[in-house]
């Protein structure tokens, strides 16, 4: 009995033409929705003047559908026992699933203003770059659409710049008709216990972001783990969303649609700064905003971003420290609401639900160069949106799990 | 050590054109922005312009433009200055010096003497 | 374009005592004001840039003070090696411009 379904879940996870997990691979049977909450701005004079608290009001959720897309390119290679692929990236918007339009207007950062300092912290180019925020009547903050925030807008200080840079600027611009990877996975023909665990992303082993171990592409993409999952497992995994690999540790059993899986939870640990956690030393790059790296709680991305000054947390600053969190006024860290867990149905080790939880902050610093900045005080993380990336196994794919799967074992 | 090294003293004609050109070393010559200066006979000091070899980004004084034109060979880490349709006027020192981030002028080569005379 | 009017425009002075440049500007420069020396057949060498920051090795008996649109460059206890024209330099704005200069003699 146990011997015949052990070796049908190792024959049906295996990533190739055929099997159960492959079809489910190549194009995800879960609706994966997206939401987000913006951060608008209710004092942006007093901050740009003052160098006061910025209060911030979330307004959300605004909801997307992705990962709806199949992916692309699949090319097994039955030497190194590897499938290749791209993952497509699209947006929907669900008005229905939303508290307004696409239209909603919101008063965020101006994160071209923001980053041109941070990328050009020569002063000769800082004076020319100030004359041209001043002339396309640019300053801190902005008003901006839903749509222009997440998908691009032309920027009118950008389009003011005489040498060739991209003038759209958005949080997730580009992203509609872009692809995520190429990734490339082992398909588990040869070792089960190593199939979905990434070999290589954009043909390469490393991040090329991070010093030392903090490099590596770690585990799978989370949407599947090996087989025979056990709860005293450290689940790793990649997100390219976050530019490193993470993990997820055991938190508790729960019965999902009547199929038992295992929560996997993201500790405060990982999150944590080298002072709490030695392993995370590789992540802390940059000694003066980290405060000599004894923040915690927000990564920064730049080296992923162009250099832009982009830093990933938790919403609400969730497990950061308080010095990060200290200048912003308007946050309500709750462990239930802005927590990412994965619900891993242990004997496939499939992901059968999940919710992924982060927040985009942007660093904005004093310049003396830049009049909108000139009169800050202070460096802040200035919080610009935090998205809550949802899926759960429909309900007739978990009663085809159950009868396939679980209701076999019992 | 930073160091700028110009070329040579100059005498040109008048109507004719002179390109001169400041050599660095000890930094990555990418990151700093080169500003031509110019000094005539027992006078003050004046901003020519300005090149941020990264991207090529110039800016000029506008009492120089059409005068001077700033160029960079990021493959010999070497800045360049012509100035065209010389006059009298245009007699004098001219300097290159660099940036040091938020320090304006921090190394400065040792000058180019251009004479324009018939 | 900001102007910078530098005075006085030379002076002469006893070894040991103490010089005071002045320089003007025609718009509020914040404090981005440098302050540069230049003695005969050489090129300036910067002293004291924005913020009235004394450069590293230059001695401490040259400072500067001024916000906005008025600032003025001391040397205390004048030394004979401090022969030189002295110039200002604001920088808050394109075109960057100098002070017309101040030749300093001892007498």
């Known amino acids: 009995g146990d011997m015949l379904i052990e070796k049908t879940i190792k024959r049906e996870v295996v990533l190739e033409e055929g099997t159960t997990a492959f079809k489910n691979w190549v194009k995800t049977g879960t609706t994966v929705y997206r939401q987000f909450w913006i951060f608008d701005v209710q004092n942006p004079d007093d901050v740009a003047k003052n160098s006061s608290k910025i209060k911030v009001k979330q307004r959300g959720p605004y909801t997307y559908r992705v990962r709806y897309l199949a992916k692309e390119n699949i090319t097994q290679d039955p030497e190194d026992h590897t499938v290749s692929f791209v993952q497509p990236n699209g947006a929907i918007f669900e008005p229905s699933l939303s508290v307004g339009t696409e239209d909603d207007n919101f008063t965020v950062l101006n994160l071209a203003v923001a980053a041109a300092p941070h990328i050009y912290q020569n002063s000769f180019v800082q004076v020319v770059l100030n004359s041209l925020i001043k002339k396309s009547k640019s300053s801190m903050f902005q008003t901006r659409s839903l749509k222009e925030l997440l998908w691009g807008y032309k920027d009118p200080f950008l389009s003011l710049v005489p040498y060739p840079i991209s003038t759209t600027v958005g949080v997730f611009y580009p992203y509609n008709d872009t692809v995520d990877g190429v990734y490339k996975v082992f398909n588990g023909k040869d070792n089960i216990s190593k199939v979905a665990i990434i070999e290589s992303y954009k043909g390469k082993r490393n991040l090329s972001y991070w010093p030392s171990y903090c490099d590596m592409i770690n585990g799978t993409d989370a949407a599947s783990f090996p087989p025979f999952v056990e709860k005293s497992r450290t689940l790793r995994f990649f997100s390219s969303d976050i530019c490193r690999s993470i993990y997820a540790v055991f938190g508790s059993e729960i019965d999902l649609k009547g199929i038992p899986v295992y929560r996997f939870v993201l500790p405060a640990n990982a999150f944590a700064s080298p002072l709490q956690n030695p392993d995370n030393h590789c992540f802390c790059t940059e000694k003066v905003i980290s405060n000599n790296c004894t923040s915690y709680g927000v990564l920064d991305i730049g080296k992923c971003k162009e250099g832009k000054p982009v830093y990933i947390s938790l919403p609400h600053f969730l497990h950061a420290s308080p010095d990060v969190s200290e200048p912003i006024e308007g946050l309500h860290p709750n462990e239930d609401e802005h927590r990412t867990y994965l619900d891993v149905e242990p004997i496939t080790g499939f992901t059968l639900q999940f919710a992924k939880r982060l927040q985009v902050n942007i660093l904005v610093k004093p310049a003396r160069k830049i009049e909108a900045l000139k009169n800050l005080k202070r460096p802040y993380i200035v919080p610009i949106l935090w998205l809550n990336e949802t899926g759960t196994i429909g309900d007739e794919k978990a009663e085809m799990f159950k009868t396939q799967v679980t209701g076999k074992i019992k | 050590e930073v160091q700028l090294q110009q070329s040579g003293p100059e005498l040109v004609k008048p109507g004719a054109s002179v390109k001169i050109s400041c050599e660095t070393s000890?930094?990555?010559?990418?990151?700093?922005?080169m500003h031509w200066v110019k000094q005539s006979h027992g006078k003050s000091l004046e901003w020519i312009g300005g090149?941020?070899?990264?991207?090529?980004?110039?800016k000029y004084n506008q009492k120089f433009k059409g005068k001077a034109t700033l160029t960079v060979d990021k493959s010999s880490s070497t800045a360049y200055m012509e100035l065209r349709s010389l006059t009298s006027e245009d007699s004098a020192v001219y300097y290159c010096?660099?940036?040091?981030?938020?320090?304006?002028?921090?190394?400065w080569g040792q000058g180019t003497l251009v004479t324009v005379s018939a | 374009e900001t102007t910078v009017t530098q005075s006085p425009a030379s002076l002469s002075m006893a070894i040991g005592e103490k010089v005071t440049i002045r320089c003007i500007t025609s718009?509020?420069?914040?404090?981005?004001m440098n302050w540069y020396q230049q003695k005969p057949g050489e090129p300036p060498k910067l002293l004291i840039s924005?913020?009235?920051t004394l450069r590293p090795g230059v001695p401490s008996r040259f400072s500067s003070s001024g916000y906005g649109t008025d600032f003025v460059f001391t040397i205390e206890n004048l030394l004979s090696e401090d022969v030189a024209d002295y110039y200002c330099?604001?920088?808050?704005?394109?075109?960057?411009?100098f002070g017309g200069g101040t030749k300093l003699e001892i007498k």
């Open positions: 010096a660099r940036d040091r981030y938020d320090v304006w002028f921090a190394y």
């Open positions: 090149i941020y070899p990264n991207n090529g980004a110039t």
């Open positions: 718009t509020d420069i914040d404090d981005d």
């Open positions: 924005e913020g009235n």
């Open positions: 000890g930094h990555t010559f990418t990151e700093y922005t």
């Open positions: 330099l604001q920088s808050d704005n394109l075109p960057l411009t």
